[in-house]
């Protein structure tokens, strides 16, 4: 008698490993014999698809080599024309051992930046990813985290983060290890010990020390008045990523000596500079003429201090006057960071206008010195305490960087604005602010012995302070 189809063994969930065989069984009782069709995710599986084998009158579906994309719901439908068609469904869960699809690569990174070591994985169940540094499991901390993707992110990379890394992907079916990669941390060149300034007698020997570090270890070059050092002997030693350079000089003239530490990061270089002066006791230059030319100021340190339209005097006793004079103000500028808010802008104005003197507009380029009154205003009013301390240190030989030997004027040797008003330069930053009469400084009880032009302003708003000069 005709009998409608009945599925006697409903489909069940099948677990299968990639590249293995998976079989679904759909046993049907019916008369006449039914037609059985199979679907995957509601899409008909074609009989001639070579990835599948359909046997036992369609009751067995075999996937010959499982791929991870075979995951899904498989249904068999039986129909023999008697009664309705019947259907049974089951899932195929493709199980997969962990596989690292995007392994980590060697990374070179500059200290302080963010490093990401990739480790993208596949697997079912989803693998957990951990990292090994050297021979030990890597512990996560405030700077180190394993991302959802499996990649390792290190914020604010430090030297100690350098080393060998590998990622490990693990699930219930197995473990996969990436190849070992290297994280190299590069560090910008940095001067650990700057050369110290010296005031010596003519014909004496002086050794200037400069110590620098960085990864890779920097090279040190010495510059004398803007030129590569032509005389003197240089001795170098490297230990624990620190380079120590000693320049021995036979002193016959004063000079500005610059230690330049440089290292390379890919195509770019990082540079650190430090300068020292070597002055000669009771040295007077055997030249009355001012040697130099006039140019627009193109530096950074004194940008906000110098008059925009004025030309400044560049002294050609330096091979590269712009560089040498900028370095002079930069070094002295850094020393001004510790002085009082009243002193600092005034001292900066004095410093910039002394090192980068305004050019006389006459036939031959000559620098216009600062008017004595303005120099004294800085010395005896704005910076009385600091000036006194500096002079005390100088007399006791304690002043570490005697940069002021070149960059701070001797007020008594400057011309007075009362002699010839055009023969000396005023510091507009120190002039009384007529728009805002509230900018008088609090007068100290000890009256300054100085004929100050008008009255200087103590309001920081009436000073221009430029950003610090970056040496890298």
């Amino acid at each position: 008698l005709p009998k409608a189809p009945v599925i006697t063994t409903p489909l069940e969930t099948v677990d299968a490993l990639v590249e293995e065989v998976a079989t679904f069984m759909c046993a049907v009782e019916s008369y006449p014999q039914p037609e059985i069709s199979w679907t995957r995710n509601k899409i008909l599986i074609k009989l001639f698809d070579t990835r599948y084998s359909i046997r036992e009158n369609g009751q067995l579906l075999t996937i010959l080599s499982v791929e991870d994309s075979d995951d899904g719901i498989y249904c068999c439908t039986a129909n023999n024309g008697v009664g309705g068609a019947v259907e049974s469904c089951g899932a195929l869960q493709v199980k997969m051992k962990p596989k690292i699809t995007r392994p980590p690569i060697n990374v070179k990174i500059i200290e302080g930046l963010k490093a990401v070591l990739p480790c993208t994985t596949m697997g079912n169940p989803k693998p957990s990813v951990s990292w090994i540094k050297g021979d030990s499991p890597l512990r996560e901390n405030s700077r180190t985290a394993v991302l959802e993707s499996g990649s390792l992110r290190i914020h604010n990379v430090q030297k100690e983060d350098a080393g060998q890394y590998r990622c490990v992907a693990k699930n219930s079916l197995g473990t996969a290890y990436s190849k070992v990669v290297k994280l190299e941390v590069e560090v910008f060149a940095r001067i650990l010990r700057a050369p110290e300034s010296h005031n010596v007698t003519f014909g004496s020997f002086v050794t200037l020390h400069c110590t620098a570090t960085g990864i890779p270890v920097p090279t040190i070059t010495w510059i004398e008045n803007g030129n590569a050092v032509s005389s003197g002997s240089i001795q170098e030693s490297v230990k624990d990523r620190v380079i120590d350079s000693r320049l021995q000089l036979f002193i016959t003239k004063p000079g500005l000596y610059t230690c330049i530490a440089t290292n390379k990061h890919g195509e770019k270089f990082s540079t650190a500079k430090a300068a020292a002066t070597v002055s000669i006791a009771e040295w007077s230059k055997p030249q009355k003429d001012n040697k130099g030319y006039c140019a627009q100021y193109r530096g950074e340190v004194c940008n906000a201090v110098l008059a925009k339209d004025a030309l400044v005097f560049l002294n050609t006793s330096y091979a590269d006057p712009e560089e040498a004079q900028e370095l002079l103000v930069h070094t002295a500028w850094n020393e001004l960071k510790v002085v009082s808010p009243l002193c600092r802008p005034a001292a900066e104005a004095l410093l910039c206008n002394h090192v980068f003197q305004e050019c006389s507009p006459g036939v031959v380029p000559t620098p216009i010195p600062i008017c004595r009154e303005y120099c004294l205003a800085v010395k005896e009013l704005f910076c009385a305490k600091e000036w006194l301390a500096m002079e005390e240190k100088t007399h006791r030989g304690l002043y570490r960087s005697e940069m002021h030997l070149l960059s701070v004027p001797e007020c008594s040797k400057l011309p007075s604005m009362h002699w010839d008003p055009t023969a000396c330069a005023r510091l507009p930053h120190l002039d009384y602010n007529k728009e805002n009469p509230k900018t008088f400084p609090p007068m100290t009880s000890s009256k300054p012995s100085v004929d100050i032009p008008n009255l200087p302003s103590s309001s920081s708003s009436s000073f221009s302070v430029s950003p610090t000069y970056s040496m890298t």
Epitope: Q287, K288, Y293
Partner: antibody, heavy 121, light 107 residues
Framework: QVQVQESGPGLVKPSQTLSLTCTVS??????????WSWIRQPPGKGLEWMGV???????YYSPSLKSRTSISRDTSKNQFSLHLSSVTPDDTAVYYC?????????????WGQGTQVTVSS | SYELTQSPSVSVALRQTAKITCGGD??????AQWYQQKPGQAPVMVLY???RRPSGIPERFSGSNSGNTATLTISGAQAEDEADYYC??????????FGGGTHLTVL
């Protein structure tokens, strides 16, 4: 770009006064950091500086020619002039006017093409 | 007065180095300038402030100045460098002085 151009008589009689004018274009003769000079070159000889007028009108003269030389200017025409008195045949030369610039250490960065002056009766 | 001394002539083989000197008392304390003059033309500044090249002047022109001698060096002299060369300084009394000139021959 500043340009300077000399003009004046090509022939001057001995004992007379030689007067030349230099016309400046592309820049003012009163501009700070610039000065304006006269330089001459006798035939087959070297250059000789005669004198200069500064941006503010002040003048300086070669010690050897000081007694006979005068430089003046006409700012409305942007011109400056050379006057050389009591000329002799030794004053025969090509006369150049030139700009000196503090930006190049007072070197002469712009020259006229020169004007030939012959002193002869 | 201030005197600047130049040798009247200097010869150099093509592409070799020519040195032209200018002697003066303590000239190293002054800015030395150099001018090139070709026949029938006005002089052209080639160096100022001892060693600085104006734009447009080839890199083969360089200079130095110390003691009593300023030097103009032409490294790898070319045929077009054949000309008269004059040194020039200003003194402290605002007087300009020229050297007698040196004729450079490029062989």
């Amino acid at each position: 770009q500043v340009q300077v151009q000399e003009s004046g008589p090509g022939l001057v009689k001995p004992s007379q006064t030689l007067s030349l004018t230099c016309t400046v274009s592309g820049g003012s003769i009163t501009a700070r950091y610039y000065s304006w000079s006269w330089i001459r070159q006798p035939p087959g000889k070297g250059l000789e500086w005669m004198g200069v007028i500064a941006y503010d009108g002040s003048t300086y003269y070669s010690p050897s020619l000081k007694s006979r030389t005068s430089i003046s200017r006409d700012t409305s025409k942007n011109q400056f002039s050379l006057h050389l008195s009591s000329v002799t045949p030794d004053d025969t030369a090509v006369y150049y006017c030139a700009r000196g610039s503090s930006r190049v250490a007072a070197a002469f960065d712009s020259w006229g093409q020169g004007t030939q002056v012959t002193v002869s009766s | 007065s201030y005197e600047l001394t130049q040798s009247p002539s200097v010869s150099v083989a093509l592409r070799q180095t020519a040195k032209i000197t200018c002697g003066g008392d303590n000239i190293g304390s002054k800015n030395a300038q150099w001018y090139q003059q070709k026949p029938g033309q006005a002089p052209v500044m080639v160096l100022y402030a001892d060693s600085r090249r104006p734009s447009g002047i080839p890199e083969r022109f360089s200079g130095s100045n110390s003691g009593n001698t300023a030097t103009l060096t032409i490294s790898g002299a070319q045929a077009e460098d054949e000309a008269d060369y004059y040194c020039h300084v200003w003194d402290s009394s605002t007087n300009a002085w020229f050297g007698g000139g040196t004729h450079l021959t490029v062989l």
